[in-house]
């Protein structure tokens, strides 16, 4: 699983009018890390285990990048020119990854009224427009705006995505928070489902990092695929995750189930209460 | 313009909490943070802490937690520090001022010279 | 708490001439550093903010360089006016930290 750190910025027009404001959030491992406060025009951390992630640090740094790009991105607005009467928003998705092997990835994505219309993969330098009409019309005036001065473009794109690698990197290093191993919380329940047939749900909670093995064992042998159900590994909002396995057994069998949890070399079995 | 006004004096007896004031005039109070420092005579300035008049956010440097009480009254667009339980280290003058951006500091006021004696 | 260190405590120099003031930083701070300017019996005014960007209003003779934990303030030709105190504030770490200052002085 890649370390991931991904901006989200939308910027709004109203009557072809480019708005002030911008509205700003940040994820870092999945995981809501900050967002852009504009009353207060302060990057703010969201929640406590984002404050721990960079200890006693201002995020003075966060909030100078968020404005920033903020401003860049109004820029954009300005120079898109269908701009109907009404709102309008622009959003920028961009998104760097470090992978276990240190290898890198990064990617950019344009929207406009919540529709892609533009990507790009910084590695390959390469654009991509959806095939819509509306969308190549778009994306070749923003295409048009950032070449208006193609070098510093290519500058300004790269020293971005390097801005986010470094920032990540800052992150991983300045922080236990992102080293910290947490065990997932194991909860085992129960309920009936059709006559003679019973739901076993086994789930793990608050665990650090994302990666985990949860699966239901018969007799010591781990069920098909099939057979299960799997929720996804979803952030809990406390910089940690949860997730969840289910299956189908007979009613009478349940001492032969047991829910098997694998989190960072350590492992466990939970059987179905009675 | 943009004005911070601060008393010039207060004389203050040892224990005897006193509320110093700031008024702010010439643009909007409840946008942006308003600071407080510290300046004894013949020394540096010292960080005491900010607060956001929108809803009193306060920030304390840990060393004036039980020192300093910051509060803003938005109707008369006013920012106070209170210092508690005074002794003769806490003779200084101190300053609000402004943020302009994050944590830079443009407009400042006067000061107000607090003395604290018996 | 990040301690800034301003040295020299006193310079003298003559009018005209360029002066440098410098401020080091006990960890690395990046570029979250700000320069004041405290005449005798007046307040502080900000001068740059993160380490080289201007302030509208402060005269072009004042610039700043630096990143990490070296810092540099430059008048580049000394007036009767910039006589007064000069500190560097950061605000990379909480608490937000000012130095010492330095003494500018006229010979």
């Known amino acids: 699983e890649p370390h991931s750190l991904r901006y989200n910025l939308t910027v709004l027009s109203w009557d072809g009018s480019v708005q002030s404001g911008f509205l700003a959030e940040v994820h870092l491992d999945g995981q809501p890390f900050l967002r852009y406060d504009r009353q207060k025009c302060r990057a703010k951390p969201q929640g406590q285990w984002a404050e721990d992630v960079l200890g006693n640090k201002t995020w003075d740094r966060e909030t100078r990048d968020l404005t920033g790009n903020g401003k860049d991105l109004r820029m954009t607005l300005a120079h898109i020119k269908d701009q109907k009467e009404g709102l309008h928003s622009l959003q920028e998705i961009r998104v760097c990854e470090i992978h276990e092997d240190n290898s890198t990835r990064s990617s950019q994505h344009f929207y406009y009224d919540g529709e892609l219309f533009l990507s790009q993969n910084v590695e390959t330098e390469e654009w991509t427009v959806p095939q819509s009409s509306r969308a190549q019309t778009l994306a070749m005036n923003v295409r048009n705006f950032l070449k208006e001065d193609a070098m510093k473009t290519k500058t300004h794109y790269h020293a971005m995505h390097a801005d986010c690698l470094q920032e990540l990197r800052r992150y991983l290093e300045s922080s236990v928070v992102l080293r910290r191993r947490v065990p997932p919380m194991v909860n085992v329940t129960r309920s009936e489902a059709s006559e003679g047939n019973i739901t076993v749900t086994c789930r793990a909670s608050s665990f650090y990092p994302r990666n985990i093995t949860l699966t239901w064992r018969q007799d010591g042998v781990s069920l098909s695929h099939d057979t299960q159900q799997w929720g996804d590994v979803l952030p809990d909002g406390n910089g940690t995750y949860q997730t969840w396995v289910a299956t189908r057994i007979c009613q009478g069998e349940e001492q032969r189930f047991t829910c098997y949890m694998e989190h960072s070399g350590n492992h466990s079995t939970h059987p179905v209460p009675s | 313009q943009v004005q911070l006004q601060q008393p010039g004096a207060e004389l203050v007896r040892p224990g005897a909490s006193v509320k110093l004031s700031c008024k702010a005039s010439g643009y909007s109070f409840t946008s942006y943070w308003m600071n407080w420092m510290k300046q004894r005579p013949g020394q540096g300035l010292e960080w005491i802490g900010m607060?956001?008049?929108?809803?009193?956010?306060?920030r304390l440097n840990q060393k004036f937690k039980d020192k300093a009480t910051l509060t803003v009254d938005k109707s008369s667009s006013t920012a106070y520090m209170q210092l508690n339980s005074p002794t003769s280290e806490d003779s200084a003058v101190y300053y609000c001022a402004r943020e302009m951006g994050p944590y830079t500091l443009d407009y400042w006021g006067q000061g107000t010279s607090v003395t604290v004696s018996s | 708490d990040i301690l800034l260190t301003q040295s020299p405590a006193i310079l003298s120099v003559s009018p005209g001439a360029r002066v440098s003031f410098s401020c080091r930083a006990s960890?690395?701070?990046?570029?979250?550093i700000h320069w004041y300017q405290q005449r005798t019996n007046g307040s502080p005014r900000l001068l740059i903010k993160?380490?080289?960007e201007s302030i509208s209003g402060i005269p072009s003779r004042f610039s700043g360089s630096g990143s990490g934990t070296d810092f540099t303030l430059s008048i580049n030709s000394v007036e009767s006016e910039d006589i007064a105190d000069y500190y560097c504030?950061?605000?990379?770490?909480?608490?937000?930290?000012f130095g010492a200052g330095t003494k500018l002085e006229l010979k």
């Open positions: 607060i956001h008049p929108s809803d009193s956010e306060t």
């Open positions: 993160y380490a080289s």
């Open positions: 960890q690395n701070i990046d570029t979250s």
């Open positions: 504030q950061q605000s990379n770490y909480w608490p937000l930290t």
